[in-house]
């Protein structure tokens, strides 16, 4: 959890989703005219996001408490979860409408379908997460969150297919962290780096969070991490809550979320 954009929330809220991202001027919030907002997006190879694109991003977790220009001179911002200081207690796109005065100063919402993205909120029964650009080396200064939320009663079986991150003794530079919860605070399982494949992990509940961070220097090959659903009736979910059994790590039951 952390204080950001005027509200207290956890890292489920994505910084970028479905090609949509938020930009502000170097001088800070609400400094861009419509023409400047357009320029910001275009200089990065994108364009101002449409209302539909912003809403599509919001639906998969894009949440920013700052009004910004969209295509056609519209202004608004995406709210996933209402908060007292943001969005008037509503969810959805808080829409200020099409502005007649294009010299008003707001932030910008850009859309770039080619932007390298990572992370998201996932409810599929199985999926493979890859470091950005895999199988090519990942870039410096990456931060990605993958939040898995399955049906109540289901569990998550995580396995590492490829793994090659910069190695340092404390995994302080580049690392993957796994949390047996829906945020990056509770249920810490472990931090991983180097090129040894970590053992499989099975969650205690129906949610899990993976965080990938790379620093500003050395990069490496990256990773592929697969998850599959373990249904309540399946044999592996009945295993004892021991720290490790074979090549699987079972976590003592703590976190479950509807």
């Amino acid at each position: 959890w952390g204080f950001k954009n005027g509200i207290f929330h956890n890292s489920i809220w994505l910084e970028q989703a479905a090609g949509v991202y938020h930009r502000e001027a170097r001088a800070g919030r609400y400094k861009l005219t419509y023409a400047e907002a357009k320029a910001v997006c275009e200089f990065e190879g994108g364009r101002l996001a449409t209302y539909k694109q912003l809403e599509a991003a919001r639906k998969i977790g894009f949440h920013v408490c700052a009004a910004g220009w969209m295509a056609k001179g519209r202004v608004g911002y995406p709210i996933v979860k209402p908060g007292p200081n943001c969005g008037f207690g509503k969810t959805g796109i808080i829409d200020y409408g099409i502005r007649l005065n294009r010299s008003e100063r707001w932030d910008a919402y850009c859309y770039n379908p080619h932007a390298k993205e990572c992370g998201g909120v996932f409810t599929d029964p199985k999926r493979i997460f890859k470091s950005p650009g895999f199988p090519n080396e990942y870039d410096d200064n990456q931060v990605c969150y993958w939040h898995i939320r399955l049906k109540y009663g289901q569990r998550i079986h995580l396995s590492f297919l490829d793994f090659d991150l910069e190695h340092d003794p404390g995994c302080l530079a580049d690392y993957v962290e796994i949390y047996d919860s829906y945020d990056d605070v509770h249920g810490f399982v472990g931090r991983y780096c180097g090129d040894e494949l970590p053992e499989d992990i099975i969650s205690t509940g129906n949610v899990m969070t993976l965080k990938f961070l790379s620093d500003a220097s050395v990069t490496a090959g990256g990773f592929q991490i697969k998850y599959v659903t373990v249904d309540p009736a399946s044999k592996s979910s009945q295993a004892k809550n021991t720290s490790t059994t074979g090549n699987k790590k079972f976590l003592p039951g703590r976190f479950s979320h509807l």
Epitope: R26, K31, A35, E36, E42, F43, E44, G45, D139
Partner: antibody, heavy 120, light 106 residues
Framework: QVRLQQSGAELAKPGASVKLSCKAS????????MHWVKQRPGQGLEWIGY????????KNKQNFKDKATLTADKSSSTAYMQLSNLTYEDSAVYSC?????????????WGQGTTLTVSS | ENVLTQSPAIMSASPGEKVTMTCSAS?????MHWYQQKSSTSPKLWIY???KLASGVPGRFSGSGSGNSYSLTISSMEAEDVATYYC?????????FGSGTKLEIK
């Protein structure tokens, strides 16, 4: 400290191509954008275009679209500009300069410049 | 293209004299930046975001302006200030420089 080291002077014939380099050190190459600027003798400065090394995205000024090709090699922290189909008007000093990608843009560090002479 | 017109093209000032040069933009911009270039060297960032002095720039320099009109001022001219000064806008495509003001000493 930040340093942008450019390749040495070039002498080329009309119609030929040259590839100028700009090696960055003292900072994280992929965290900044690299721009190229042209200056003809006794004249002002003209922006050519830029590359975002992290993504490879480039944007050139319209009149340099067919003239300048910008590339970057992340492994060696080097930006390149290839100038093709050279004419006498391409004789100039070409400088690389970095910006931090925050808007509005400015160049905080410059290379020392590469002198290109086009002569038959 | 946003054309930046600098005036005067050439000026000279005595040591200790106040110097002001201007930059006029054909389209309004929120910020202007300034570069100093001495002969046979690369330009140096001198003033950014209209009024912020780059690292190592003496306090006698200042920048101001808004919209279409910006200026660079030296409160008290010194010999080391002899150079050409270029204004620059990084707000719109294509990025553009002014034609420069050459500052000489009397």
């Amino acid at each position: 400290q930040v340093r942008l080291q450019q390749s040495g002077a070039e002498l080329a014939k009309p119609g030929a191509s040259v590839k100028l380099s700009c090696k960055a050190s003292g900072y994280t190459f992929t965290s900044y954008w690299m721009h190229w600027v042209k200056q003809r003798p006794g004249q002002g400065l003209e922006w050519i275009g830029y590359i975002i090394p992290s993504s490879g995205y480039t944007k050139n000024k319209q009149n340099f679209k067919d003239k300048a090709t910008l590339t970057a090699d992340k492994s060696s922290s080097t930006a390149y500009m290839q100038l093709s189909n050279l004419t006498y008007e391409d004789s100039a000093v070409y400088s690389c300069a970095r910006s931090d990608g925050s808007y509005p843009y400015y160049f905080d560090y410059w290379g020392q410049g590469t002198t290109l002479t086009v002569s038959s | 293209e946003n054309v930046l017109t600098q005036s005067p093209a050439i000026m000279s000032a005595s040591p200790g004299e106040k110097v002001t040069m201007t930059c006029s933009a054909s389209s309004s911009v929120s910020y202007m930046h300034w570069y100093q270039q001495k002969s046979s060297t690369s330009p140096k960032l001198w003033i950014y975001d209209t009024s912020k002095l780059a690292s190592g720039v003496p306090g006698r320099f200042s920048g101001s302006g808004s919209g279409n009109s910006y200026s660079l001022t030296i409160s008290s001219m010194e010999a080391e200030d002899v150079a050409t000064y270029y204004c620059f806008q990084g707000s719109g495509y294509p990025l553009t420089f002014g034609s420069g003001t050459k500052l000489e000493i009397k």
